[in-house]
């Protein structure tokens, strides 16, 4: 696993602890809270990242409208069970025997039950929409100069793949970035929407998960763009199941 | 290496205006914003605004709106800030800064201008 | 406007002296936050931003801390060369600084 070998560091994942005791005194480094080996080449999972933050102490509208089944992470965080890969288990319970089913980026997509809850596989989140509202700049923002540079950002930054971001949308204040990537588009080594997504976010909330500085900061053609807020929509490829309760 | 070399002290006249520049080398000019920082004897640090030289954008403090102009000339990597009916409260230190490479704070910084408005 | 509150206004110390100063933000900056010294007839120099990144070049005996609305940077053992006043700025929204904290020798 690549790790910065001078000073036996994860690149891509602070929450780590790192040593030089891999194959032939290589660095290698393992996630706080699961202790499970990690990539320092690539993004850690979201499940991994969460558990590591729970051990830790403290013109025309161009706009898209998020479907109807659309999922916003309201539940915040918690201390997830991943699989041997990192990835969610499908069913998440916690301390109290209440049980859900999550999808892909972790999220609850049915209502909360009992240990005799069955969740029989992991739905895929396929399409992820980040939608931000930037505070006042000196002018609007070049929709291509903004496109390129969050284009530019998800590919170096976060190393997703360029086809993974379908679109940017801008209508000032406004800025929406659309991620979709379907089970049969992900081939090995490609890193998923939902990670990229997460580390963007945590990036944006000033926590960044790379070593090294806080946040991130962007700008467009030198223009600083600060962002006021930002909601993450998530859609599955099957739809969520929530009772009609929940809905009112 | 990035320098920001800003013009000398200026003694004037209630009333009258004033135009302090700003001359960057060392990288490139329209990559990066010019901020202006007002700073009273004895004071503290204000932000008063800044121009994306890429676009001539400019944003500015409220509290500044109406008598401050930035501007900015490419071909001479120089920004300038004007500053119009100048009465003695203006009497302070003005800085340029430039921007972290990759952060919002400000990194680099001239050494200052004194404007001294005295009748 | 976002106010920053810093606080003390001046404090006395020793060389040797472990130094704390604290600046607290009017909302949530994301640990958008700066810190700077300040020597008199110089212009500021940053010292940290993102709240806990180090300058290169600045002594490892500086140090940011903090989140939400409160931050705090910490000389662990004060030096001659440190004597100075120091600011802390947000930039989530737009660019604002504290009022300053003066560090005398005692």
């Known amino acids: 696993h690549t790790a910065a070998q001078d000073n036996c560091t994860c690149p891509t994942n602070k929450m780590t602890v790192c040593s030089p005791d891999g194959p032939g005194g290589r660095c290698q480094c393992r996630a706080l809270g699961s202790g499970m080996a990690v990539d320092c080449s690539t993004l850690t999972s979201k499940c991994l990242l969460l558990k590591a933050r729970m051990s830790a102490p403290k013109n025309a509208r161009t706009l898209v409208r998020p479907s109807e089944h659309a999922l916003v992470d309201n539940d915040g965080l918690y201390d997830p069970d991943c699989d041997p890969e990192g990835r969610f288990k499908a069913r998440q319970c916690n301390q109290t025997s209440v049980c859900w089913c999550v999808n892909s980026v972790g999220v609850r997509r049915t209502d909360k039950g009992d240990l005799s809850l069955r969740c029989d596989e992991l739905v895929r989140t396929h399409h992820i929409l980040i939608d931000l509202r930037h505070r006042p700049t000196a002018g609007a923002f070049n929709h291509s100069d903004l496109d390129a540079e969050l284009r530019r950002l998800f590919r170096e930054r976060y190393r997703l793949h360029p086809k993974f971001v379908a679109a940017v949308h801008y209508e000032q204040p406004t800025i929406q970035i659309e991620l979709r990537q379907n089970t049969s588009q992900k081939a090995a080594g490609d890193v998923d929407i939902g990670d990229a997504a997460y580390y963007f976010e945590r990036d944006i909330k000033g926590e960044s998960l790379f070593q090294g500085r806080g946040g991130l900061d962007l700008r467009v053609r030198g223009e600083p763009l600060q962002v006021e807020r930002t909601l993450i929509y998530y859609l599955d490829e099957i739809p969520p199941k929530f009772s009609m309760k929940r809905l009112t | 290496q990035v320098q920001l070399v800003q013009s000398g002290a200026e003694v004037k006249k209630p009333g009258a205006s004033v135009k302090v520049s700003c001359k960057a080398s060392?990288?490139?000019?329209?990559?990066?914003?010019i901020h202006w920082v007002k700073q009273k004897p004895g004071q503290g640090l204000e932000w008063i605004g800044y121009?994306?030289?890429?676009?001539?954008?400019?944003k500015y403090n409220e509290k500044f709106k109406g008598r401050v102009t930035i501007t900015r000339d490419t071909s001479a990597s120089t920004a300038y800030m004007e500053l119009s009916s100048l009465r003695s409260e203006d009497t302070a230190v003005y800085y340029c800064?430039?921007?972290?490479?990759?952060?919002?704070?400000?990194?680099?910084w001239g050494q200052g201008t004194l404007v001294t408005v005295s009748s | 406007d976002i106010q920053m509150t810093q606080s003390p206004s001046s404090l006395s110390a020793s060389v040797g002296d472990r130094v704390t100063i604290t600046c607290k933000a009017s909302?949530?900056?994301?640990?958008?936050l700066a810190w700077y010294q300040q020597k008199p007839g110089k212009a500021p120099k940053l010292l940290i931003s993102?709240?806990?990144s180090l300058e290169t070049g600045v002594p490892s005996r500086f140090s940011g801390s903090g989140s939400g609305k409160d931050y705090t940077l910490t000389i662990s053992s004060l030096q001659p060369e440190d004597f100075a006043t120091y600011y802390c700025?947000?930039?989530?929204?737009?660019?604002?600084f504290g009022q300053g904290t003066k560090v005398e020798i005692k």
């Open positions: 800064a430039r921007p972290h490479f990759e952060t919002h704070a400000m990194d680099y």
């Open positions: 060392g990288y490139t000019f329209t990559t990066y914003v």
């Open positions: 121009i994306n030289p890429n676009n001539d954008g400019t």
């Open positions: 909302e949530d900056i994301f640990n958008r």
């Open positions: 993102g709240a806990t």
């Open positions: 700025q947000q930039y989530w929204n737009t660019w604002t």
